[in-house]
């Protein structure tokens, strides 16, 4: 129903504590360089109206809509041209025009420092003297370097946050409490943000319908006891939701949230057995659990696919008076058959059957030319298995680290203009699968590898997005969503590329690196085999190896020696020296 | 809202011909398939014939195949069919319909439909 003041009635449905934290988390998404103070200062002043508004509806400016709010407020924020340069020009347009100018400039990669995390003590003294202020910086550091986090789920993480530091600052020691437990929190809140990016990507580029059908595929697979016309309610406000988030409607999106939650809740009935445990937890509890609920027992007797879209002779009639309807309730079918597929492949199925349909409904006999559909999805079906199989199989040979620099040689000779930085953030992150998804049950690997790994290249498709420079990337990135990982995985060496020239200075180390931490120390040798391959694409695995480990047993006997400096000076050079033959 | 109007029918001898019109409006004509049922007095729906959002994909029942021919103009948001060689049997109300979401494909009684136009074959 209409409100005639909808900040009032936002701030009245979610309460003060998730307004304020939902009001900051969008003006740190939309205005990245700012400060917490600067953000913080603009929240209190918003909530301060917001709260004029609920004791008087009519009050000044109250009908106004919120984006004719925020944005007035993000407009009258000085220096902004100096700041933020074109960004500024969004100003000058009316609403809506102004909000999406706005959403445009969201930076994917802004150049922030990496969110560091204090020492214990520190961390500890802070939380306990304020910790309103503690989780506000949390949440203004997060949504700034993630734009398209999902806000109602950061709301969650900062809940998280809380209940680790008061937890972990009562202990005797802080360190080893929290470490483990904020370093998990922090995995999970960076998985959380690649794969809401990928869902917006999805809205942004192809539309309500792709993302639509995302969700029925998803659900169906989660809520196999659900009918179709559940489904559909249930993929129809779960697509509500993500458009409000990715538009940066984030109260309305988070109220609406509550909403689907509260919804499953009083009907758990027709949707799944699985849910009561969910349902008794606390709001941001329950809506994160809900998300992730394990799925449902299929049901025992579920007719053969086949019966209704392919035998039936009412197929085309059918698909032809209701093209998307009849698509979906394939979609439902066939998903909730298969909560061992991901959800990538399960869509293209689904393209695979509508493009057969239309194909053949236009034929002289369509059952003669579409019967054979089933059996053409097989080489579909077999492709991301032998992906999943192949790349575990690796993964279990070689560990995290050893697979990582198996994918980065891969993704490097693929497309090697890419900056070796990308590179290395996209190998490392794609390298994770193998810890995430292969020591799952057989049955739940392929769809944590598929769907993980396409939220990973999407990520890769914006970054390359901002400044092309490879045309397999390109070509890749242009493609629908669902298709980016086949065409990712069957890219071959760029026959293109002309090798870098060997520059002994990017192979050459100095004594800091011993005092790396063990990731950064990572990164160092990664980028150094990035940039190896770029100057020999076709260096075989074995020479790689031979200068990798070369490498290694460098950085181990100058970091051991007594005067690491002058070891580095002098073996340094040495070592490129052996590099460049090994290579030759 | 949706809204369908057909236009057309009439009194017909054996072996004539007639074309009947629907004027669709309220919805999103040119993506939407688009269905021609019929009801004799005393009976049930019938479904007649189906044409696909692009045209491309058209069916038929078995008894007006041959004889029948489903057409749309998406730029005139019209449906059209075409009865030639009219038989007494085709004598009914003829209905344009349009799926209605949340029903069942192919469940006629749950589609948007118009007021109908009557068809008589009769000498």
């Known amino acids: 129903e209409a409100h005639k003041s909808e900040i009032a009635h936002r701030y009245n449905d979610l309460g003060e504590q998730h307004f304020k934290g939902l009001v900051l988390i969008a003006f740190s998404q939309y205005l990245q360089k700012c400060s917490y103070d600067e953000h913080a200062k603009l929240v209190q002043e918003v909530t301060d109206f917001a709260k004029t508004c609920v004791a008087d509806e009519s009050a000044a400016n109250c009908d106004k809509s919120l984006h004719t709010l925020f944005g007035d407020k993000l407009c009258a924020i000085p220096n902004l041209r100096e700041n933020y340069g074109e960004l500024a020009d969004c100003c000058t347009k009316q609403e809506p025009e102004r909000n999406e100018c706005f959403l445009q400039h969201k930076d994917d990669n802004p150049s922030l420092p990496p969110f560091e995390r204090p020492e214990a003590e520190a961390m500890c003294t802070s939380f306990k003297e304020n910790p309103t202020t503690f989780m506000g910086h949390y949440l203004h550091e997060v949504a700034r370097r993630h734009p398209y986090f999902y806000a109602p789920e950061l709301l969650y993480y900062a809940e998280q946050y809380n209940e680790i530091l008061t937890q972990c600052c009562a202990e005797a020691d802080k360190e080893s409490c929290l470490t483990p437990k904020l370093d998990g929190v922090k995995e999970k809140a960076l998985v959380s943000s690649v794969r809401q990016r990928m869902k917006c990507s999805s809205m942004q580029k192809f539309g309500e319908r792709a993302f639509k059908a995302w969700a029925v595929a998803r659900l169906s697979q989660t809520f196999p006891n659900a009918d179709f016309a559940e489904i559909t309610k249930l993929a129809t406000d779960l697509t509500k939701v993500n458009k409000e988030c990715c538009h940066g409607d984030l109260l309305e999106c988070a109220d609406d949230r509550a909403e689907l939650a509260k919804y499953m809740c009083e009907n758990q009935a027709t949707i799944s057995s699985k849910l009561q445990t969910c349902c008794d937890k606390p709001l941001l509890k329950k809506a994160h659990c809900l998300s992730e609920v394990e799925h449902d027992t299929m049901p025992a007797d579920l007719p053969a696919i086949a019966a209704d879209f392919v035998e039936d002779q009412e197929v085309c009639k059918n698909y032809a008076e209701a093209k998307d309807v009849f698509l979906g309730t394939f979609l439902y079918e066939y998903s909730r058959r298969h909560p061992d597929y991901s959800v990538s492949l399960l869509l293209r199925l689904a393209k695979k059957y509508e493009a057969t349909l239309e194909k053949c409904c236009a034929e002289a006999n369509p059952p003669a030319c579409y019967g054979t559909v089933l059996a053409e999805f097989q080489p579909l079906v077999e492709e991301p298995k032998n992906l999943v199989k192949t790349n575990c199989d690796l993964y279990e040979k070689l560990g995290e680290y050893g697979f990582q620099n198996a994918i980065l040689v891969r993704y490097t000779q693929k497309a090697p203009q890419v900056s070796t930085p990308t590179l290395v953030e996209a190998a490392r992150n794609l390298g994770r699968v193998g810890t995430k998804c292969c020591t799952l049950p057989e049955d739940q690997r392929l769809p944590c590898v598929e769907d993980y790994l396409s939220a990973i290249l999407n990520r890769v498709c914006l970054l390359h997005e901002k400044t092309p420079v490879s045309e397999h990337v390109t070509k890749c990135c242009s493609g629908s969503l669902v298709e980016r990982r086949p065409c990712f995985s069957a890219l071959t060496v760029d026959e293109t590329y002309v090798p870098k020239e060997f520059k002994a200075e990017t192979f050459t180390f100095h004594s800091d690196i011993c005092t790396l931490p063990e990731k950064e120390k990572q990164i160092k040798k990664q980028t150094a085999l990035a940039e190896l391959v770029k100057h020999k694409p076709k260096a075989t695995a074995e020479q790689l190896k031979t200068v990798m480990d070369d490498f290694a047993q460098f950085l181990d006997t100058c970091c051991k020696a007594a005067d690491k400096d002058t070891c580095f000076s002098t073996e340094g050079p040495n070592l490129v020296t052996r590099c460049k033959d090994a290579l030759a | 809202q949706v809204q369908l109007q057909e236009s057309g029918g009439g009194l017909v001898q054996p072996g004539g011909s007639l074309r009947l019109s629907c004027a669709a409006s309220g919805f999103a004509f040119s993506t939407s398939g688009m269905v021609w049922v019929r009801q004799a007095t005393g009976k049930g729906l019938e479904w007649v014939s189906t044409i696909s959002d692009d045209s491309r994909i058209i069916r038929y029942a078995d008894s007006v195949n041959g004889r029948f021919t489903i057409s749309r103009d998406n730029a005139e948001n019209t449906l059209y069919l075409l009865m030639n060689s009219l038989k007494p049997e085709d004598t009914a109300v003829y209905y344009c319909?349009?799926?209605?979401?949340?029903?069942?494909?192919?469940?006629?009684?749950?589609?948007?439909r118009g007021q109908g136009t009557q068809v008589t074959v009769s000498s």
């Open positions: 319909a349009t799926y209605r979401a949340g029903s069942r494909i192919g469940s006629y009684e749950d589609y948007y």
